[in-house]
């Protein structure tokens, strides 16, 4: 008989990672913190008017490798960074928008400062 407080070795299970979420908080988030078995992320992208928007949150383990790979999308300025090394690690991620390509100056809208 096992002593109380003693059990067989645990089966490996994913450990929850808590991430800061902003503009991307799921329905179960509390105080702008979400939980995941995958990665925390911070992303910067241009909105329809060309203004930079920063989003952060949780990515599930499934598909996160692909989502965290910063593959360039034509005519879309976007950058994403992911982390897992500690809880709320995405507080310290600061992705920057990739530089405008020359073609974007021609095709894209003109933004006045």
């Amino acid at each position: 008989k096992k002593e109380d407080g003693e059990s067989t070795a645990p089966t490996p299970r994913p450990k929850i990672l808590r991430c800061k979420c902003h503009h991307h908080c799921p329905e179960d988030s509390v105080n702008n913190i979400c939980s995941t078995d995958g990665y925390c992320f911070t992303m910067i992208e241009e909105d329809d008017s060309g203004m930079p928007v920063v989003t952060s949150g949780c990515l599930g383990l499934e598909g996160s490798d692909f989502q965290c790979r910063d593959t360039p999308i034509p005519h879309q300025r976007r950058s994403i960074e992911c982390c897992t090394e500690r809880n709320e690690c995405n507080k310290d991620l600061h992705p920057t928008l990739p530089p405008l390509k020359n073609r974007d100056f021609v095709d894209g809208p003109i933004h006045h400062k």
């Epitope: 645990p10 299970r13 450990k15 929850i16 329905e27 939980s35 599930g60 500690r86 709320e88």
Partner: antibody, heavy 117, light 113 residues
């Protein structure tokens, strides 16, 4: 095998503080969250909070903020919960328990805390 | 906070009978992202610490007899013991692991006739 060892009992005077311990073995200490749960006779189970031993990140039940402080010593694979300004309401069994995903895979045997003068 | 309500508070059964106990949550425990219900059941025998029986509403913990069956979705959950044994005399608690603070039901005490 997983073991979460807790002292059987603690007797403390009202107004004092106590530091309860939970010594973990049989698994990688930093791979699970460590939780603390309170059980008073006839009052069910109450979650106090949890700590991730890998980075000491804590979550607390609002009800226990200011009452409980969770810490870990990774060198000895021991979790601690300090309870302050003790009253008779704090008399209870306190369990440590580990989780991957916020359900409790394994529990310690519990420490019975008695607050009495 | 999510409030968990268990019923009945106690029930007396004979060995071999089928037992069902209920747990209701004040909000849905179903996550749309993975279609899982974040509810666990525990058994606590007199003088012992609780023991995990079921998590994600219906996943039986390794080593738990298959007479223990968790079911339900959203806000209504059931733990069924298909054929109660003398060693099942215990308190049974449900717990939501949907978000923090984690909360428990008040328990159902199973007594034997």
């Amino acid at each position: 095998q997983v073991q979460l060892q807790q002292p059987g009992a603690e007797l403390v005077k009202p107004g004092a503080s106590v530091k309860l311990s939970c010594k973990a073995s049989g698994y990688t200490f930093t791979s699970y969250w460590m939780h603390w749960v309170k059980q008073r006779p006839g009052q069910g189970l109450e979650w106090i909070g949890d700590i991730d031993p890998s980075d000491r990140y804590t979550n607390y039940n609002q009800k226990f903020k200011g009452k409980a402080t969770l810490t870990v010593d990774t060198t000895s694979s021991t979790a601690y919960m300090q309870l302050s300004s003790l009253t008779s309401e704090d008399s209870a069994v306190y369990y440590c328990a580990i989780s991957g995903w916020d359900y409790f895979d394994y529990w310690g045997q519990g420490t019975t805390l008695t607050v009495s003068s | 906070d999510i409030v968990m309500t268990q019923s009945p508070s106690s029930l007396a059964m004979s060995v071999g009978q089928k037992v069902t106990m209920s747990c209701k949550s004040s909000q849905s425990l179903l996550k749309s992202s993975n279609q899982k219900n974040y509810l666990a059941w525990y058994q606590q025998k007199p003088g012992q610490s609780p023991k995990l029986l079921v998590y994600f509403a219906s996943t039986r913990e390794s080593g738990v007899p298959d007479r223990f069956i968790g079911s339900g979705s959203g806000t209504d959950f059931t733990l069924t013991i298909s054929s109660v044994q003398a060693e099942d005399l215990a308190d049974y608690f449900c717990q939501q692991h949907y978000n923090i603070p984690l909360t428990f039901g008040a328990g159902t005490k199973l007594e034997l006739k």
